[in-house]
């Protein structure tokens, strides 16, 4: 695969992935109630990281948000934080991949500008990816953990035995914007990846030119770039294409210096 | 405004089949629930099942699962309660209501006597 | 299925004066996601359908006189009309909104002293 096209895929896929992300963080169904071996009710539980809502059976919802800061359990602030930093991270990453891509030119920057950028971008991705799947993890930690404790309490006598009044335990499970994050994230994950499996494409390598230069002369002359024109084809205007026959040509291969992965 | 008008007074024999008819108005029909209560002569309600009219997603009663079955038509805005293998004790006033929130029952039909008797 | 149970069946309160009729449930009637009560009360004249008075146990039908009001929770609800007029002269239900099948209690029937 060229350099242009995985660079290309890994940003398509970071943005997805990042889109995504955006998606589960705003979603309301974090977590949903538990209908399994639940009596029936007419009314429907869910909640998100910023809200709960209520379906009844009438079609009416109603969303509450949680207007406290300090009332909150601190790993659903954690599984916020984490989600906010992974969009905050997916942001400049997306930033900063545009101004990386090698279909893209911009001024006079080089390969080696735009490795580094792409390289930067994919660590962003990297990271925006790991803090999604650790803050739904978390999530679904927390809600494994409280559906075991809600079931022990049911199966415990506290949901009222004998002539006492039974009371219904709600209990809750994994929620779509989980399955939405985990996915996401790894997209984005994967998409960061891709954009730094690229960036190596990207780095001029001066060996490999010493090389093929030294052959091509056939004179026992030192190398200097650019110098030997009409012998080695390392002419300043000639293109890749000369090299790589058949290679595809970019629209920046003007500034740019061939390496042995710009065609892997 | 939201009306409901039921189909008229049945006389059944014990063992047969009767279907009353529930016409909505002045809302968006598939967009409540249609609920069917009964009152038997003196007695209280009895909640019996309900209909999604826009999905034709059912709940019923289950003292009365296999002998009722509620649909839709949504084009005539009409909901059916059909009621089968007919019993004297279910000589009653059926009647229809919409659903309302906290899924209460604010709009009803005016009521249908059905009577069963041999 | 959820039991409701009313008390008393019947009630004779002078006119003016307070009324208030009980319901109570087998099963807590509270929504943990919104706090809400999911029971209803309705009132039924002879030869006519139920009329829905309250629902979220204390919310007001519009329309509904102000001397109608709903309270309770979970389990214990009460309807009480604050100063009877002869119109209240019906039957009043509570309804299980929550779980299905929803029941209704037994009826309270309400006369005038």
């Known amino acids: 695969m060229s350099v242009t096209a995985c660079q290309g895929l890994g940003f398509v896929v970071s943005l997805i992935g990042f889109a995504g992300i955006i998606a589960a963080t705003c979603m309301d169904q974090w977590s949903t109630q538990d209908l399994y071996n639940n009596p029936v009710t007419a009314v429907f539980n869910y909640q998100g990281l910023w809200r709960s809502c209520v379906r009844e059976s009438s079609g009416f919802t109603e969303c509450r948000g949680y207007f406290t800061l300090l009332g909150l359990p601190a790993m659903l602030q954690a599984v916020r934080a984490l989600m906010i930093v992974g969009i905050v991270l997916g942001v400049i990453g997306i930033l900063v991949s545009i101004f990386a891509l090698k279909c893209i030119r911009i001024g006079s920057m080089d390969d080696s500008a735009k490795a580094k950028m792409t390289l930067t971008s994919g660590i962003l991705f990297i990271i925006s990816g790991i803090c999604a799947i650790i803050g739904v993890s978390v999530f679904a930690n927390m809600l494994v953990t409280n559906f075991w404790m809600s079931t022990a309490n049911m199966y415990s006598g506290m949901g009222g035995m004998g002539g006492m009044v039974q009371t219904v335990q709600t209990r809750y499970t994994f929620g779509a914007a989980l399955f939405v994050g985990w996915v996401a994230g790894g997209l984005t994950l994967i998409g960061g990846v891709m954009m730094c499996i690229a960036c190596r494409g990207l780095t001029p390598d001066d060996s490999n030119f010493k090389a093929v230069s030294y052959h091509a002369s056939g004179q026992n002359v030192a190398y200097r770039p650019g110098g030997f024109k009409a012998s080695t084809g390392f002419g300043s205007n000639t293109r890749n294409k000369k090299i790589y026959d058949g290679g595809a040509r970019t629209e920046d291969d003007e500034q740019s210096h061939p390496t042995k992965y710009d065609y892997v | 405004q939201v009306q409901l008008v039921q189909s008229g007074a049945e006389v059944k024999k014990p063992g047969s089949s009767v279907k009353v008819s529930c016409k909505a108005s002045?809302?968006?029909?598939?967009?409540?629930?249609i609920e069917w209560v009964r009152q038997a002569p003196g007695q209280g309600l009895e909640w019996m099942g309900l209909?999604?009219?826009?999905?034709?997603?059912?709940n019923y009663n289950e003292k009365f699962k296999g002998r009722v079955t509620i649909t839709a038509d949504e084009s005539t805005s009409t909901a059916y309660m059909e009621l089968s293998s007919l019993r004297s004790e279910d000589t009653a006033v059926y009647y229809c209501?919409?659903?309302?929130?906290?899924?209460?029952?604010?709009?009803w039909g005016q009521g249908t006597l059905v009577t069963v008797s041999s | 299925d959820i039991v409701m149970t009313q008390s008393p069946d019947s009630l004779a309160v002078s006119l003016g004066e307070r009324a208030t009729i009980n319901c109570k449930s087998s099963?807590?009637?509270?929504?943990?996601?919104?706090?809400?009560?999911?029971l209803a009360w309705y009132q039924q004249k002879p030869g006519q359908p139920p009329k829905l008075l309250i629902y979220?146990?204390?919310t007001r039908e519009s329309g509904v006189p102000d001397r109608f009001s709903g309270s309770g929770s979970g389990t214990d609800f009460t309807l009480t009309i604050s100063s009877l007029q002869a119109e209240d002269v019906a039957v009043y239900y509570c309804?299980?909104?929550?779980?299905?099948?929803?029941?209704f209690g037994q009826g309270t029937k309400l006369e005038i002293k």
């Open positions: 209501a919409r659903v309302y929130y906290g899924n209460s029952f604010a709009y």
């Open positions: 002045g809302y968006a029909f598939s967009n409540y629930l």
């Open positions: 209909i999604n009219p826009g999905s034709g997603g059912t």
């Open positions: 099963q807590s009637l509270l929504n943990s996601g919104n706090n809400k009560n999911y």
């Open positions: 979220w146990a204390s």
């Open positions: 309804q299980n909104d929550y779980f299905y099948p929803f029941t």
